[in-house]
């Protein structure tokens, strides 16, 4: 399908002008290539009428032009002095007329209505209000005032000053007679319907002395605003319906093939399930305006959208509406990224979030979509740091890999983390994207002790087991803070051959803190990554306590959720048995080591990656 988009139908009246805007993907090639407006002939060929290269056909000379706006990815064709002959089928496009990078536009030019002399013309959008002014002479001041609608050769009474109201106008029309000295009465019609369109006649008095005034009321369907957005991106519909409906329920609906309008979202709590997790209705301002944000745009989101106000929260004739025609460009600048990310309870996810690469300095955000109250999105983390304290130790936003993508890592997953999350920046709002986190059955791949208690001044060694499938990945430990996760210095992992013959035993990367200080207390993450792309993580909390005073049963230099049947080794090292660990099968080899011996030359914090055999054999 062509990525060029414009208005499908354009209608105007003889002698008037039209302005036709066409959209295209603003790639470098597209921005500079030829733009054209051509008319389709009976043969199927499309004859150029005006182009961006300066060509103007003789038929259009002096009344048409084409202007390219490369920075917006749009071009505009203006045509003046329209005649009935201009009605027909056209194309706006890029490149060569026959190439197919175009959009079909139908132009209809109609004859203006034949109106009686002195007719006042009122042009009003459907759902809005019109005030028809009716002048009269002094002698008709005390006499009956009335408004008629002309239907063919007959005149139908609409309202008069003797309290008659035509049933078609019930509850939405009033006739106002001014005080003495003012020689104009007015008729106000609210919530205009398309059927109100037509010629009206004001009348004051009767007989040959009566005052008459013609009024032509043109009730227009709102011209849909064209909206051109990228696949996977985001759109915002700003809806301003006026103060008169400020306190009425609002809605956004999409026109279907039957020309009815299906509610997408409304302020009464209704929401189309197709938009679950990717729509927000922003609260209205005191003037009654509101906005609807939709992210994660799909091709099937294309179509005509209406926003409106009605107590039922859905489209009703005669209430104000605003219209948009949404086109979703499949030649998207927004890269593909998973829309669903799966994790296991206790495990982790690493979510890749796209942003406009031209805005690398923009602030990055991640929020959790909540469906309650028309949707809302509390921020969880920003590139400046953590926002919600309940995510302490398990959520981090990383600027890597950069160049249009940032990463959000969430670990210690529970079923309550399942849901929809939005990637945001404070820059280009069209790059808002949605990801769904699903919690599935399974075990975390990385295994660490539950909680660890370290002793001041001594050495702490924390193991992290990883399966063979991660043998080629880079392993790391980092210390979490609310502004990120600071990677700890890594010891040389030894020759890469160590992982070539990976057996069924899990491999081990261990963190050593030597000597333990008060500042070491906090969350530590063990993780795997490939280059700047992050994989799984596991978190462990390290508490720091003073050394036990002599006389206690034994010195416990380091504890890691010790099990009841733990053994105290001669060296003062406690060995953790199977029960202490989240998964006994993988932790049979584990030791949390606190070495009270001489540590000269050891680093303050170090990471060692090796097989469990290399850690010193079995603990049994």
């Amino acid at each position: 399908k062509s990525p060029v988009f414009g208005p499908q139908e354009v209608s105007s009246v003889e002698g008037n002008s039209v302005s036709i805007k066409c959209y295209y993907p603003p790639t470098s090639v597209n921005r500079h290539t030829r733009k054209y407006w051509c008319r389709k002939g009976a043969s199927g060929r499309c004859i150029t009428l005006v182009s961006s290269e300066g060509y103007v056909s003789s038929n259009y000379a002096g009344r048409a032009n084409l202007t390219n706006f490369p920075e917006n990815g749009t071009f505009v064709v203006n045509i003046a002095q329209l005649s009935r002959d201009d009605s027909g089928h056209y194309k706006c496009g890029l490149g060569i007329n026959s190439r197919g990078l175009s959009f079909d536009v139908s132009l209809e030019v109609s004859q203006g209505p034949e109106l009686p002399n002195g007719t006042e013309v009122y042009t009003v959008d459907v759902g809005r209000t019109v005030t028809i002014k009716c002048p009269f002479k002094t002698e008709n001041a005390p006499k009956t005032k009335a408004l008629y609608k002309k239907i063919g050769q007959t005149s139908v009474l609409v309202i008069d000053s003797r309290n008659y109201v035509n049933p078609n106008y019930k509850d939405r029309i009033r006739l106002r007679i001014p005080g003495t000295g003012q020689l104009i009465f007015t008729v106000v019609i609210d919530r205009l319907r398309l059927s109100d369109h037509g010629l009206y006649l004001c009348q004051a008095g009767d007989g040959s002395n009566r005052d008459e005034k013609n009024a032509d009321l043109q009730v227009l369907e709102p011209e849909p605003e064209l909206v051109y957005e990228d696949l996977r991106g985001s759109v915002t519909f700003h809806c301003a319906l006026g103060l008169e409906v400020a306190n009425v329920a609002k809605f956004l609906c999409r026109v279907n093939s039957r020309e009815t309008c299906d509610v997408v979202i409304n302020t009464l709590g209704k929401r189309d399930s197709a938009f679950e997790g990717r729509i927000l209705l922003n609260p209205q301002d005191k003037d009654g305006s509101f906005s609807v944000v939709i992210t994660g745009l799909r091709k099937e989101d294309e179509g005509r959208y209406l926003c409106g106000a009605h107590s039922d929260g859905q489209l009703q004739e005669g209430w104000p509406i605003q219209a948009w025609q949404l086109f979703v460009n499949e030649e998207s600048t927004i890269p593909r990224s998973p829309t669903v990310v799966k994790g296991v309870a206790g495990g982790s996810v690493a979510v890749l979030c796209p942003y406009n690469p031209k805005e690398s300095q923009s602030l990055k955000y991640w929020c959790l979509w909540e469906g309650a109250q028309n949707g809302r999105c509390p921020l969880l983390v920003e590139s400046q740091g953590l926002v919600q304290e309940q995510y302490e130790g398990r959520l981090s936003l990383l600027q890597e890999p950069g160049n249009g993508t940032f990463t959000v890592i969430l670990n210690q997953l529970t079923t309550q983390d399942a849901g929809f999350y939005w990637c945001l920046t404070n820059g280009d709002t069209r790059w808002r994207t949605t990801v769904e986190i699903k919690i599935i059955e399974g075990e975390p791949n990385l295994k660490v002790p539950g909680n660890v208690t370290a002793v001041l001044g001594e050495t702490l060694n924390i193991p992290c087991h990883f399966p063979c499938k991660f043998s080629s990945y880079e392993k790391y430990w980092c210390k979490w803070s609310n502004t990120g996760c600071q990677t700890l210095p890594s010891q040389d992992e030894g020759p890469s051959e160590a992982f070539v013959n990976c057996d069924e035993n899990s491999r081990l990367v261990s963190l050593t803190l030597n000597p333990v200080t008060r500042a070491d207390e906090g969350w530590y993450w063990c993780g795997v990554k490939q280059g700047h792309f992050y994989g799984e993580t596991a978190a462990v909390y390290v508490a720091v306590e003073e050394k036990k005073v002599a006389g206690s049963r034994y010195v416990s230099p380091a504890k890691a959720d010790a099990a009841p049947d733990e053994k105290v080794l001669d060296s003062g090292v406690r060995e953790i048995e199977n029960k202490a660990i989240q998964d006994p099968r993988l932790f049979a080899e584990e030791k949390v080591v606190a070495d009270t011996g001489d540590q000269a030359g050891g680093s303050r914090a170090s990471v060692d990656s090796s097989s469990s055999e290399e850690q010193g054999g079995s603990s049994k």
Epitope: G375, R376, P378, W422
Partner: nanobody, 124 residues
Framework: QVQLVESGGGLVQAGGSLRLSCAAS????????MGWFRQAPGKEREFVAR????????DYADSVKGRFTISRDNAKNTVYLQMNSLKPEDTAVYYC?????????????????WGQGTLVTVSS
């Protein structure tokens, strides 16, 4: 979390005007819904006004509608409350508050970051 500091309070005569400012530090507030609340002596803290992250949507307590205007300058990381036609019953400590909601319906319970307050006294 974001730190908020109010200023601009003081003594003013009934019918007068004041402009309160709330300067944020610690992080930018351009995705925060910001609000003003007040607490008169012996009364509960009450909502005054709020403004969404973009500045396009505002909301006011009925008692201040038409007299108070909330605005924000994201570039300066500051929120303002312009108070006109002040009445003695507007006397209170005024608190600035922030809510870390990118978008959507944010209730008055959702404000998590608070300033220390600035006293506004309106004499008759």
């Amino acid at each position: 979390q974001v730190q908020l500091v109010e200023s601009g309070g003081g003594l003013v005569q009934a019918g007068g005007s004041l402009r309160l400012s709330c300067a944020a530090s610690g992080r930018t507030i351009n995705t925060y819904v910001m609000g003003w609340f007040r607490q008169a002596p012996g009364k509960e803290r009450e909502f005054v006004a709020r403004i969404d992250w973009s500045g396009s949507s505002t909301d006011y307590a009925d008692s201040v509608k038409g007299r108070f205007t909330i605005s924000r300058d994201n570039a300066k990381n500051t929120v303002y409350l312009q108070m006109n036609s002040l009445k003695p019953e507007d006397t209170a400590v005024y608190y600035c508050a922030g809510s870390a909601y990118y978008s959507g319906y944010v209730t008055h319970r959702d404000f998590g970051s608070w300033g220390q307050g600035t006293l506004v006294t309106v004499s008759s």
